[in-house]
């Protein structure tokens, strides 16, 4: 968590920001809330980015005003603008690229003040990974796939019965690149698994932890999967 | 209600040029993007391009390049698609349709009536 | 630029019945895939939106999945006015780009 104040003729503001990533391909957004004022017209938004010329997005007096905005954001960016009156400045990003990670300024102006706060943001892909019985390996065998991950993760097993064992002799994990080149599908295969135990598939890398787990039993398979982004502070 | 009503049907001669107009109201002009598509008799949608009322910002399908203008004008609400040097093969219905999202640029969610344009010699 | 391969190009299916409509991009991955229905000399009415988002006032029946390359439109059980054209909308990248179109018709 981040938090900013003003520090210019008029009174500061609190803005606080939180880190987040972005999953390439689909929607991110960049959270910012600040103290709210009761007249809209009287709120300015800034989105900006380091190392980028243009604004990021740009909304002041109820609306969207876009003429500064730079053309790696065109058609791409909204806040959400029916809760800005009540202190939300957040951004919407559309189809997140790798390039969009950086560090952005969520700056603020009311009639109460001026704010701002940085944001971390974080590029790359990461999805649930599901936890199935391999029938037709010769012996019993697990296998964990998940669709997108991005830097290549690391992926270790563990289980309920064998707590604090290494798998990583009985397991085997492959990387299969994309059709898109850039993200990764993760599969992971562990043998030589018991009965009446729950084993778990956990894939991490720098923007986030997922795990599925999975229990055998002689009657039944049950199945759960979760995922955790690793960087949200605020500031 | 979000409402997109286009100009009437036009009937052209090859190599002359034609202007559809889309009024819109019922929404914030200025706040959303505005595309073009159009259909050939039987044929399937094809995207002419956008613009961002807001700020004038256009993209247009590489095919059409050089040949479509996509301009607005925020006095009236309106957007126009101006199609030149046509021909036979320009013949088709042509749509307008706001694109959700505000800023961002959205599928299109609300259409108009479409407008036929003919080219005929 | 992306293209958007649509199949099949019309299919016969009576009411009732489960269909299914699959849209290839060319190449990327993004789920901004929308789908929609058009009938004859109506305008196109957008269905689903972001793979999977509902429009609102689209009934259930109605649903889309998909990821990486691969996009699908499934109807669990045709009604009547169903039968309409089908059309896959690719609109993540700057170019847009439509399916070819499925014509979903009576048997």
């Known amino acids: 968590l981040i938090i900013g104040f003003g520090i210019s003729g008029r009174h500061s503001i609190t803005v606080t920001t939180v880190a987040s990533a972005g999953n390439i391909g689909e929607d991110g957004i960049l959270s910012c809330t600040f103290e709210p004022d009761i007249k809209l017209s009287d709120i300015v938004i800034q989105w900006l980015k380091e190392g980028v010329l243009g604004l990021v997005h740009e909304f002041k007096e109820g609306k969207d005003e876009l003429s500064e905005q730079d053309e790696m954001f065109r058609g791409r960016t909204a806040v959400f603008a029916d809760q800005v009156i009540v202190g939300n400045a957040s951004l919407r990003l559309k189809n997140v690229q790798l390039t969009d990670a950086g560090t952005y300024k969520c700056y603020i102006i009311t009639s109460k003040g001026k704010g701002n706060a940085n944001l971390e943001y974080k590029t790359g892909a990461f999805s649930m990974p599901e936890v199935n019985v391999d029938y037709n390996a010769s012996s019993e065998t697990l296998r964990c796939e998940a669709p997108r991950w991005f830097p290549q993760p690391t992926v270790v097993w563990a289980s309920q019965v064998d707590q604090g064992a290494n798998f990583s002799e009985v397991s085997n994990t492959s990387f299969e690149l994309n059709s898109e080149n850039v993200t990764m599908k993760v599969v992971s295969v562990l043998y030589n698994v018991t009965i009446n135990n729950t084993y778990s598939c956990m894939i991490e890398n720098d923007i986030a932890k997922a795990t599925g787990d999975i229990k055998v039993t002689e009657s039944e398979i049950k199945r759960r999967s979760h995922l955790q982004l690793l960087n949200s502070k605020a500031s | 209600e979000v409402q997109l009503v286009q100009s009437g049907a036009e009937v052209k001669k090859p190599g002359a040029s034609v202007k559809v107009s889309c009024k819109a109201s019922?929404?914030?002009?200025?706040?959303?993007?505005i595309g073009w598509v159009r259909q050939a008799p039987g044929q399937g949608l094809e995207w002419i391009g956008d613009?961002?009322?807001?700020?004038?910002?256009?993209n247009y399908n590489e095919k059409f390049k050089g040949r479509a203008t996509i301009t607005a004008d925020t006095s009236t609400s309106t957007a126009y698609l101006e199609l030149s040097s046509l021909r036979s093969e320009d013949t088709a219905v042509y749509y307008c349709?706001?694109?959700?999202?505000?800023?961002?640029?959205?599928?299109?969610?609300?259409w108009g009536q479409g407008t036929l344009v003919t080219v005929s010699s | 630029d992306i293209q958007m391969t649509q199949s099949p190009s019309s299919l016969s299916a009576s009411v009732g019945d489960r269909v299914t409509i699959t849209c290839k991009a060319s190449?990327?991955?993004?789920?901004?895939v929308a789908w929609y229905q058009q009938k004859p000399g109506k305008a196109p009415k957008l269905l689903i939106h972001?793979?999977?988002t509902l429009q609102p006032g689209v009934p259930s029946r109605f649903s889309g999945s998909g990821s990486g390359r691969d996009y699908t439109l499934t109807i669990s059980s045709l009604q009547p006015e169903d039968f309409a054209t089908y059309y896959c909308?690719?609109?993540?990248?700057?170019?847009?780009?439509f399916g070819q179109g499925t014509k979903v018709e009576i048997k």
């Open positions: 349709a706001r694109l959700d999202g505000s800023s961002y640029r959205g599928a299109m969610d609300s």
């Open positions: 190449q990327g991955f993004n789920k901004y």
């Open positions: 909308l690719q609109y993540g990248n700057l170019l847009y780009a």
């Open positions: 613009i961002y009322p807001g700020g004038g910002y256009t």
């Open positions: 972001y793979t999977s």
């Open positions: 019922g929404y914030t002009f200025t706040s959303y993007w």
